[in-house]
Amino acid sequence: TEVKVTQPEKSVSVAAGDSTILNCTVTSLLPVGPIRWYRGVGQSRLLIYSFTGEHFPRIRNVSDTTKRNNMDFSIRISNVTPEDAGTYYCVKFQRGSSEPDTEIQSGGGTEVYVLAK
């Protein structure tokens, strides 16, 4: 069966300077390939976090993704600023051998609404 990516919250509100968690779970780790978080869609989308080892300031994974059979790819964004407002998507990719990774499924998105402190 096809992998499903679930983002349970349609939206979260967070005060500027605080932290927020964006939840994402998958039903399967197959096909092999990374999970990435983006803000926005289409041409304007921005890579926010990738579960592939790179360092992303202010963002870290919530659960231990090195553990076998971990299906939780939630992230925590610290010290949220108004520029962080937008819709965040958790996206599952299939690893390509020589060609680029292929996007195969996405969560429904979580809107982050930043409140003035």
Epitope: P8, S13, V41, T87, Q105
Partner: antibody, heavy 119, light 108 residues
């Protein structure tokens, strides 16, 4: 049973204002995001505005931004749309629509109220 | 914003025939697509969500399929009450939430 009943439509001149209401019953109103969707005569459906259950999150279509204001009174189970600086192209049936609790599609709709903007 | 294009604009069929309506998205919306039925003087009614899941109380002659950019609503055997206008709506890229232009299914 979910019920959404719109009111407040009517005939106005360009530049005038109107306030639409949507009385909701049959569900926990404050737990659901609500929307206004309109349909101009002979045209398709056009999303107008969205407000979250708490009223914190609000979005508008570009075509109404700066002129329309969405609001809600959870104590009265009522959704509102304040329409200012009305134009002929705002002529439409305005529907109140309840969002699904997980995704942004519409589980339930009202019958709509007709707004006619004409000189 | 994601643009949805529905085809055909009008479908003229007889009761008992099969109706196939298409909705194309300008970019992938995965399976975040809903279908609605609208009849004059009535509230629009949710038929399908998640591209293929039937809403509560919708008869099984209605089925949805597709993912990514291409979607289909099929009415397996048209009943007299199915002659109406049908709209698709994406809820992946939002806001704005966008609808297709509609397909009118009329009686031959």
């Amino acid at each position: 049973d979910v019920q959404l009943v719109e009111s407040g439509g009517g005939v106005v001149r360009p530049g005038e204002s109107l306030r639409l209401s949507c009385a909701a019953s049959g569900f926990t109103f404050s737990s659901y995001d609500m929307n206004w969707v309109r349909q101009a005569p002979g045209e398709g459906l056009e999303w107008v505005s969205l407000i979250s259950g708490s009223g914190e999150i609000i979005y508008y279509a570009d075509s109404v931004k700066g002129r329309f204001t969405i609001s809600r009174d959870n104590s009265k189970n009522t959704l509102y749309l304040q329409m200012n600086s009305l134009r002929a192209e705002d002529t439409a049936v305005y529907y109140c629509a309840k969002e699904n609790n997980r995704y942004r599609f519409f589980d339930d709709w009202g019958l709509g109220t007709l707004v006619t903007v004409s000189s | 914003e994601t643009v949805l294009t529905q085809s055909p604009g009008t479908l003229t069929l007889s009761p008992g025939e099969r109706a196939t309506l298409t909705c194309r998205a300008s970019q992938s919306v995965y399976t975040y697509l809903a279908w609605y039925q609208e009849k004059p003087g009535q509230a629009p009614r949710l038929l399908i969500y998640g591209a293929s899941s039937r809403a509560t109380g919708i008869p099984d002659r209605f089925s949805g399929s597709g993912s990514g950019t291409e979607f289909t609503l099929t009415i397996s055997s048209l009943q007299s009450e199915d002659f109406a206008v049908y709209y698709c709506q994406q809820y992946y890229d939002r806001p704005p939430l966008t609808f297709g232009g509609g397909t009118k299914v009329e009686i031959k």
